[in-house]
């Protein structure tokens, strides 16, 4: 039945999101008759690849195909047969990509190169596949969920109940989180944006934006996990590492030529007289942070004000989306709601990380050890990140929301990446060249 | 177009339990939470609880604790409410209802009417 | 929990008058968390004005919404007898989503 004719002339696009963890593919649909040149794009499949990310593939290239099957054929079963040769597939790959490009670019194109080949069997319009830039990225997320709010157009929409606004016409920020890397992106209040490789400037439903935008690689959860132990088994006395950022009880070993493996950690490498080391969880949420905190260099700002590690932020402004793990590490936590204040948060993080591993394991008994033994790291992080990293306040931190989907489509950068590739974002294009596109032919 | 179709009345017997059922189309069902909500002949709102249909994480007001139970089946797109212990104060309509972001209520069952009488 | 007060409780007005509903929440709400809806006798809600302002689909422009913070309210630009029914506000920014206890709109 999924593949009859369909009443409604629609047409379909195909993202998928290589990211640092997994990969995800996600299918959009719009009318065919665009409003005034601007498509209403809506997901109506998320699916996500079993398996880590495209990266960790380097040394078993082979095994990409298989990989991608599943979710590729739920595309073929969702999108009418008809519509299967008009409709375009893009591969954006993001930060753990990145970082495989740093270690070797011939590498990176391999895995690359053997994920083109695999998507061009499918008999979709394929239109690449490509490791984007931390802007792009930081910027598609920022078109996505402010396109969702409804924050470019006054027009009536074609699903459901959708934006008409009235006013309201400030645009969200947006924060993302990844296992890689981080974004933050927004508008700054009349400020200059003293970085000209954090500036973008596009037209956007006939109305101008400066954008600030940055993306902090090696700061996403996963690597800043990697960094953290790096860093703290460095002034270990033994192959112990007792780290306040998991439960008491909790023991794990960790091998030293993984710890050494990503470019995050070079920073931190020195000669260990052990090839392993266990990791020993006491559970303290205040000690966790501090932890946290040394991987912030907060000393040196060439500009009027910084974020870390010497990168203009503007003064913060307005209210900001948070999304991706920002959103799924505090929805675990049962902390998204816009009232829990930023104390309530630092309180209930610190009962959360002083519970027993095992009182833990009993509570949250359908959930992966591997993920559930990193929340109490990740929490911890988030709020190290957003108050210290991003300089937010208790006041400002109501400003922030945690965001999972907004009419139904993922908060992230696919869905921004669809529209200006479709071209369904107006015809007057964007300034800034990471939005270009030039890649494609 | 989007709907979401309830039975339209159940009758119970006081200290009985009753499952009301939600069906969902028009929509990816995974996309959205699912809302419940109750009210009693003649008066408000209130809100019981919600469901993420994706992973089945509820939220519920303290106030319906061990009254209601929230469960899904995503193979149907269906979405249930298991009320338990019936009394008359549970008499009322409830109504199901998809959240959006700011958590407000875009697209509303029509509603099942319970009774409780013996 | 959030307290949302609506006044008045019950509302008669002639087609034709613009009316204004208020809604005063018990501790300050961003605005992207309040919204109001509109129930005719025997029918279920309908979401007329979502996060403030934005006006849900199929609703007539005669419907405004406007607030900040406290004090929230939802406006009917010219009264039409169709528009007979009772208005809640409902707030999401806080466990538990409360709702207003309704302003009845009646017709003169």
């Known amino acids: 039945t999924q593949n009859k004719a369909l009443p409604e002339n629609v047409k379909y696009g195909i993202v998928l999101d290589a990211g640092s963890s997994h990969t995800s593919l996600y299918i959009y649909k719009w009318p065919a008759e665009k409003e005034n040149d601007t498509g209403v794009v809506h997901q109506v499949e998320e699916c996500r690849v079993k398996g880590p990310g495209i990266s960790k593939f380097v040394q078993k290239v082979n095994e990409i195909g298989i990989y991608l099957t599943d979710c590729m054929e739920r595309a073929r079963e969702v999108i009418p047969r008809s519509q299967h040769q008009e409709t375009p597939v893009y591969l954006g790959a993001t930060a753990g990509m990145r970082l495989l490009r740093m270690e070797s670019e011939e590498l990176a194109d391999r895995v690359l190169d053997v994920v083109e080949r695999s998507l061009s069997n499918y008999p979709f319009d394929f239109q690449g596949a490509r490791i984007i830039t931390g802007q792009e990225e930081g910027a598609y997320g920022w078109i996505t969920i402010n396109y969702l709010l409804g924050k470019f157009s006054q027009k009536t929409r074609w699903f459901s109940i959708v934006p008409y606004e009235t006013n309201n016409q400030e645009t969200f920020g947006a924060l993302d989180l990844g296992g890689a890397s981080t974004q933050v992106t927004f508008v700054p209040q009349n400020q200059t944006i003293e970085s000209p490789d954090n500036a973008l400037q596009f037209r956007l439903y006939g109305k101008d934006y400066n954008v600030y935008t940055h993306s902090f690689l090696c700061y996403g959860k996963d690597q800043a996990l990697w960094q953290k132990l790096a860093k703290d088994i460095q002034v270990a006395s033994n192959e112990i590492l007792r780290d306040p950022c998991f439960h008491p009880g909790y023991k794990k070993v960790v091998n030293v030529s993984d710890l050494y493996k990503t470019p995050c950690t070079k920073r931190f490498e020195m000669t260990l007289p052990f090839q392993q080391f266990e990791i020993q969880g006491i559970g303290n949420y205040q000690q966790c942070h501090q932890s946290i905190l040394e991987l912030f260099n907060t000393s040196y700002c060439p500009y009027s004000q910084c974020a870390f590690n010497g990168i203009f932020l503007p003064p913060l402004q307005g209210d900001f989306g948070a999304f991706s793990a920002f959103y799924f590490v505090m929805k675990f936590l049962n902390l998204t709601s816009e009232k829990v204040s930023q104390e309530k948060v630092t309180e209930m993080m610190k009962k959360f990380c002083a519970q027993p591993w095992e009182e833990i394991k009993t509570s949250y008994a359908g959930v992966k050890e591997k993920y559930l033994s990193e929340y109490c790291f990740s929490g911890t992080y988030i709020l190290s990140l957003l108050l210290q990293g991003y300089h937010f306040t208790a006041d400002s931190w109501e400003h922030i929301h945690f965001i999972g989907k907004i009419q139904g489509s993922d908060a992230g950068w696919t869905l921004g990446y669809m529209l200006n590739l479709t071209n369904m974002i107006p015809a007057e294009q964007p300034l800034s060249t990471p939005l270009s596109h030039s890649t494609y032919v | 177009p989007v709907q979401l179709q309830q039975p339209g009345a159940e009758v119970v017997m006081p200290g009985a339990s009753v499952k009301l059922s939600c069906k969902a189309s028009g929509y990816t069902f995974t996309s959205f939470w699912m809302n419940w909500m109750r009210q009693r002949p003649g008066q408000g709102l209130e809100w019981i609880g919600e469901?993420?249909?994706?992973?089945?994480?509820?939220n519920s007001n303290q106030r319906f604790k061990g009254k209601a139970t929230l469960t899904v089946d995503k193979s149907s797109s269906t979405a249930y409410m298991q009320l338990s212990s019936l009394t008359s104060e549970d008499s009322a309509v409830y109504f199901c209802?998809?959240?959006?972001?700011?958590?407000?209520?875009?697209?509303w069952g029509t509603g099942t009417s319970v009774t409780v009488s013996s | 929990e959030i307290v949302l007060t609506q006044s008045p409780t019950t509302m008669t007005s002639s087609p034709g008058e613009k009316i204004t509903f208020t809604c005063s929440a018990s501790s300050s709400i961003n605005s992207n968390y309040l919204h109001w809806y509109q129930q005719k006798p025997g029918f279920s809600p309908k979401l007329l004005i979502y996060?403030?302002?934005n006006l849900a689909s199929g609703v007539p422009t005669r419907f405004s919404g406007s607030g900040s913070g406290t004090s929230y309210s939802l406006t009917i630009g010219t009264m039409e007898a169709e528009d007979v029914a009772t208005y809640y506000c409902?707030?999401?920014?806080?466990?538990?989503?409360?709702f207003g206890g309704g302003t009845k709109l009646e017709i003169k």
């Open positions: 209802a998809r959240g959006d972001f700011g958590w407000y209520f875009d697209v």
């Open positions: 996060r403030t302002s």
């Open positions: 409902q707030q999401g920014s806080s466990l538990p989503r409360t």
């Open positions: 469901i993420d249909p994706s992973d089945f994480y509820t």
